[in-house]
């Protein structure tokens, strides 16, 4: 019996370890700047990288421009969006912004999307300084389906610091629905 | 076989509960402010309290202003910093200042150090107010082998919140590298 | 034995996924905007939504305007604030404000309240522009004890965004207290 | 890596004027404090002038108190030395740096207190 224990705690041990690593999926996205649309409108950001740097994917999908749930759960989700200006790069059409980051949720079975969580800040970009810079952070718990999307939206894309530590979105798992 | 049973139960409730304490590290590290630095350049902040107020630390290592990796694993790192001005600190040197900070990882085997994330935000601080603040939030998912060291920067240290609730960064581990 | 043993994994899968999920409440509140406070003083928001839309709440409670810790541990703590503003909605009585959020943690046994994170920025919301806006983030670890309870405290709650994606705070258990 | 240049300076005559300029490049530094210093032959470097990062507010030296004034563009890079008035002794090679305190302290004047100095630009003041 002892044997047997012994052989229920080393199948435990692995059965404990794989559930748990396999139950675990996250992403740390961050953006593509080879590919960052113009304008100053809302728009959705597509280009992501998920495997260089910084950036990693496990047990989600990445697709499209948006990051897909692959396991139902309760998922903390982030995102960290810089803007910035130097005078070297032009004009800007207007001083006054509204640099603004919505992450929203798709669902495939109900061709629907909302926003979880919006941040950002109006700002006054102001030709007396060569140099503007500012960031957003959002964070928060949600439940998450497998099939579901999560992407996000930015103002004045044309802004954007393509740096891998200043622009980035992300999610981990951190427990079961019940 | 039923106490047996019982026998294994128990012994894995014990070893359950045992490695996933063990597999947890943890810190949230508030500054000290009777150390900061002056100057507007960029500077790392190395006295940080780890065992007082909200400050705390397990299985990981503060040791030389720098947050230690004692556990490979994947992080949630984040961090919190607040500025502030009153007119009674005395004059600005500028009212156009740039409020940043950066999340760095510095390896030793290969002694380089990356940052991880940045945040902030330039401000124009005029003098028509008596009072000024501003905070910037970053957090992101990191992959951290064993070893491995976090620190923090910041641009014009000495117009930091020296608050507890104010200035502070922490980690936690969410789970193993496969 | 064998049969034995597949009953033992069987009731340990049972025992591990049950107590794993008792293990890890969690809460994300977002703001209930029919009874928000006017003024521009600093006040403790006490109506947010716990089971509607994003809102959400297990093995923690809601009442009285607080976040009651039901279940002892380390808990990541997180808000998200937004503050708008548009000249449709009248003239501000000034122009340099203070947006600031405070998460409290007040305890029974002790009765006082402490300040666990704070966050915002000095604005000046000029008449220049017909909208203003802005974010905070905050989040952070902390050691939660059954029965402390977790609020918020924001100045000038009269500009707060009442979209639920704007103006949220939540808690997730990360691990047990040693 | 950050670079001071500056330039203007030249041979005048006493009595005489010249316009220094200061232009940085690489890091942004058009809205640091910044000063003016300068080294005559054989003698220590010398605090000229400060200007804050909005130019609201400037300090001078008393040996050049009404003669000389310091400003800035407003959102260029340039940093401005006018010098009128000038005199046999203000011959120096002048230097441009970036303050690097937060704060105004009471050692403004010292050069210690900056940071990125340029190579110096030569001023001969001589009939």
């Known amino acids: 019996i002892r044997a047997e224990k012994a052989m229920v705690d080393g199948s435990w041990l692995d059965l404990a370890k794989r559930s748990k690593l396999e139950a675990q999926p996250f992403a740390h996205l961050t953006i593509n700047a080879t590919d960052i649309p113009s304008g100053s409108h809302k728009v959705s950001l597509s280009s992501w990288y998920h495997d260089r740097g910084w950036a990693k994917i496990s047990n989600m999908t990445f697709s499209n421009g948006k990051l897909i749930v692959n396991q139902d759960g309760f998922y903390y989700l982030y995102a960290n969006i810089c803007f910035r200006h130097h005078e070297t790069s032009g004009d800007l059409a207007t001083e006054y912004l509204q640099l603004m980051v919505y992450v929203t949720k798709t669902s495939i079975k109900i061709p629907s999307s909302h926003t979880l969580m919006k941040g950002g800040s109006t700002k006054y970009w102001s030709g007396n300084s060569e140099f503007h810079f500012y960031s957003i952070n959002v964070g928060g718990f949600f439940k998450l389906r497998s099939g579901e999307e999560i992407s996000i939206e930015v103002s004045n894309p044309s802004l954007l610091d393509p740096d891998q530590d200043a622009t980035y979105f992300g999610a981990f798992k951190v427990r079961d629905i019940d | 076989i039923r106490a047996e049973k019982a026998m294994v139960d128990g012994s894995w409730l014990d070893l359950a509960k045992r490695s996933k304490l063990e597999a947890q590290p943890f810190a949230h590290l508030t500054i000290n402010a009777t150390d900061i630095p002056s100057g507007s350049h960029k500077v790392s902040l190395s006295s940080w309290y780890h065992d007082r107020g909200w400050a705390k630390i397990s299985n990981m290592t503060f040791s030389n202003g720098k947050l230690i990796v004692n556990q490979d694993g994947f992080y949630y790192l984040y961090a919190n910093i607040c500025f502030r001005h009153h007119e009674t600190s005395g004059d600005l040197a500028t009212e156009y200042l740039q409020l940043m900070v950066y999340v760095t990882k510095t390896s030793i085997k290969i002694p380089s150090s990356h940052t991880l994330m940045k945040g902030g935000s330039t401000k124009y601080w005029s003098g028509n107010s008596e009072f000024h603040f501003y905070s910037i939030n970053v957090g992101g998912f990191f992959k951290l082998r064993s070893g491995e060291e976090i620190s923090i920067e910041v641009s014009n240290p000495s117009l930091l919140d020296p608050d507890q609730d104010a200035t502070y960064f922490g980690a936690f581990k969410v789970r193993d590298i496969d | 034995i064998r049969a034995e043993k597949a009953m033992v994994d069987g009731s340990w899968l049972d025992l591990a996924k049950r107590s794993k999920l008792e293990a890890q409440p969690f809460a994300h509140l977002t703001i209930n905007a029919t009874d928000i406070p006017s003024g521009s003083h600093k006040v403790s928001l006490s109506s947010w939504y716990h089971d509607r839309g994003w809102a959400k709440i297990s093995n923690m409670t809601f009442s009285n305007g607080k976040l009651i810790v039901n279940q002892d541990g380390f808990y990541y703590l997180y808000a998200n604030i937004c503050f708008r503003h548009h000249e449709t909605s009248g003239d501000l009585a000034t122009e340099y404000l203070q947006l600031m959020v405070y998460v409290t943690k007040t305890s029974i046994k002790i009765p006082s309240s402490h300040t666990l994170m704070k966050g915002g920025s000095t604005k000046y919301w000029s008449g220049n522009s017909e909208f203003h806006f802005y974010s905070i983030n905050v989040g952070g670890f902390f050691k939660l004890r059954s029965g402390e309870e977790i609020s918020i405290e924001v100045s000038n709650p009269s500009l707060l965004d009442p979209d639920q994606d704007a103006t949220y705070f939540g808690a997730f258990k990360v691990r047990d207290i040693d | 890596e950050v670079q001071l240049v500056e330039s203007g300076g030249g041979l005048v005559q006493p009595g005489g004027s010249l316009r220094l300029s200061c232009a940085a490049s690489g890091r942004t530094f058009s809205r640091s404090a910044m000063g003016w210093f300068r080294q005559a032959p054989g003698k220590g470097r010398e605090f000229v002038g400060f200007?804050?990062?909005?130019?609201?507010?400037?300090y001078y030296a008393d040996s050049v108190k009404g003669r000389f004034t310091i400003s800035r563009d407003n959102a260029q890079n340039p940093l401005y030395l006018q010098m009128n008035s000038l005199r046999p002794e203000d011959t120096a090679v002048y230097y441009c740096a970036v303050y690097r305190r937060t704060y105004i302290s009471s050692t403004y004047s010292e050069s210690s207190e900056y940071d990125y100095w340029g190579q110096g630009t030569l001023v001969t003041v001589s009939s």
């Open positions: 200007i804050t990062g909005s130019g609201g507010t400037t």
